[in-house]
């Protein structure tokens, strides 16, 4: 059965936008005016996972690209990557765990926790123009809070 999806952009709590940095990496930086068109548009799909009032499992694909954010072990450390998939098979309701993020809403802000690696979150650095990564701490220097902006399809 088809999976429900919506198109959106994400900004971290410092209002940094997410843009492509090479073919398989995202970075976060402040954008203004026409530069806002550079930010990536996600296709957020609602998928199998732990669901409650404030927690919804999602997969984050790049709109009209066969790329999904995924969480894998690299050198024994949970790592965020952009993974290429077969567009004939994705998105699907039951995504592999590495593609699943628990979208957690707290005080009008969103966190994205890895389903594969609990307590690891999509994170950005305080510094400008740095890669988006998977971080194992909340409330520290790194930013784990985001806002979501809906994009009409």
């Amino acid at each position: 059965a088809p999976v429900r999806s919506l198109n959106c952009t994400l900004r971290d709590s410092q209002q940094k936008s997410l843009v492509m940095s090479g073919p398989y990496e995202l970075k976060a930086l402040h954008l203004q005016g026409q530069d806002m068109e550079q930010q990536v548009v996600f296709s957020m799909s609602f998928v199998q996972g732990e669901e409650s009032n404030d927690k919804i499992p999602v997969a984050l694909g790049l709109k009209e690209k066969n790329l999904y954010l995924s969480c894998v072990l690299k050198d024994d450390k949970p790592t965020l990557q952009l993974e290429s998939v077969d567009p004939k098979n994705y998105p699907k309701k039951k995504m592999e765990k590495r593609f699943v993020f628990n979208k957690i809403e707290i005080n009008n802000k969103l966190e994205f926790e890895s389903a594969q690696f609990p307590n690891w979150y999509i994170s950005t650095s305080q510094a400008e123009n740095m890669p988006v990564f998977l971080g194992g701490t909340k409330g520290g220097q790194d930013i784990t809070d985001f806002t979501m902006q809906f994009v009409s399809s």
Epitope: A1, E51, S52, K92, E96, K97
Partner: antibody
């Protein structure tokens, strides 16, 4: 409290079509997936397929050519048809609900209906 | 077709810990579920999403899933835990049960 009540013919001849219906009482119908599972006597469980309220289906590839699952949202019911049955289709057939709160797995089951195929 | 393999039977004394395994290709990258079935009854969900317990399921039931193996653990087993146990996962667009463990 959710209840799934199922019924249908219990004795079939080879080549006939198995037909079962499951009625859902309590809880919303549109927020879930609805599944059929079977279990041959003394054997394990086999997933047959699922449907959502809009009529969108997924089937077990090994049965796909013979299976039709349909839904009647006005009655909160869903049905299974399995064509060209043989003795190998003799089993207890269960209907079940897949719920988002349990990760889209089967959290409520019907009581089961024994279907025997014999000439 | 995808295959989930379980041991046909596991035997323990009351009060001991029972571990039931379910193996399948890259199973740890999928969510695993476990059902308990007693004779003449419909299956009951005891573990969902690898390690979560539905309300009403005793704390002695726990689950884990990594690599190619999901495990259901029943600690401090009781006579009423005697049953068939089935693991359950998905493969692309369809669902698969393990063969069951008595």
């Amino acid at each position: 409290q959710v209840q799934l009540q199922q019924w249908g013919a219990g004795l079939l001849k080879p080549s006939e079509t198995l037909s079962l219906t499951c009625a859902v009482y309590g809880g919303s119908f549109s927020d879930y997936y609805w599944s059929w599972i079977r279990q041959p006597p003394g054997k394990g469980l086999e997933w047959i397929g699922e449907i959502d309220h809009s009529g969108s289906t997924n089937y077990n590839p090994s049965l796909k050519s013979r299976v039709t699952i349909s839904v009647d949202t006005s009655k909160n019911q869903f049905s299974l048809k399995l064509s060209s049955v043989t003795a190998a289709d003799t089993a207890v057939y269960y209907c079940a609900r897949a719920s988002p709160s349990s990760g889209w797995t089967l959290d409520y089951w019907g009581q089961g209906t024994l279907v025997t195929v014999s000439s | 077709q995808s295959v989930l393999t379980q041991p046909p039977s596991v035997s323990v004394s009351p009060g001991q810990t029972a571990s039931i395994t379910c193996s399948g290709d890259k199973l740890g990258d999928k969510f695993a579920f476990w059902y308990q079935q007693k004779p003449g009854q419909s299956p009951v969900l005891v573990i969902y999403l690898d390690n979560k317990r539905p309300s009403g399921i005793p704390e002695r039931f726990s689950g884990s899933n990594s690599g190619n193996t999901a495990t259901l653990t029943i600690s401090g087993t009781q006579a009423l835990d005697e049953a068939d146990y089935y693991c359950y996962a998905w493969a692309d667009t369809y669902e698969v049960f393990g063969g069951g463990t008595k």
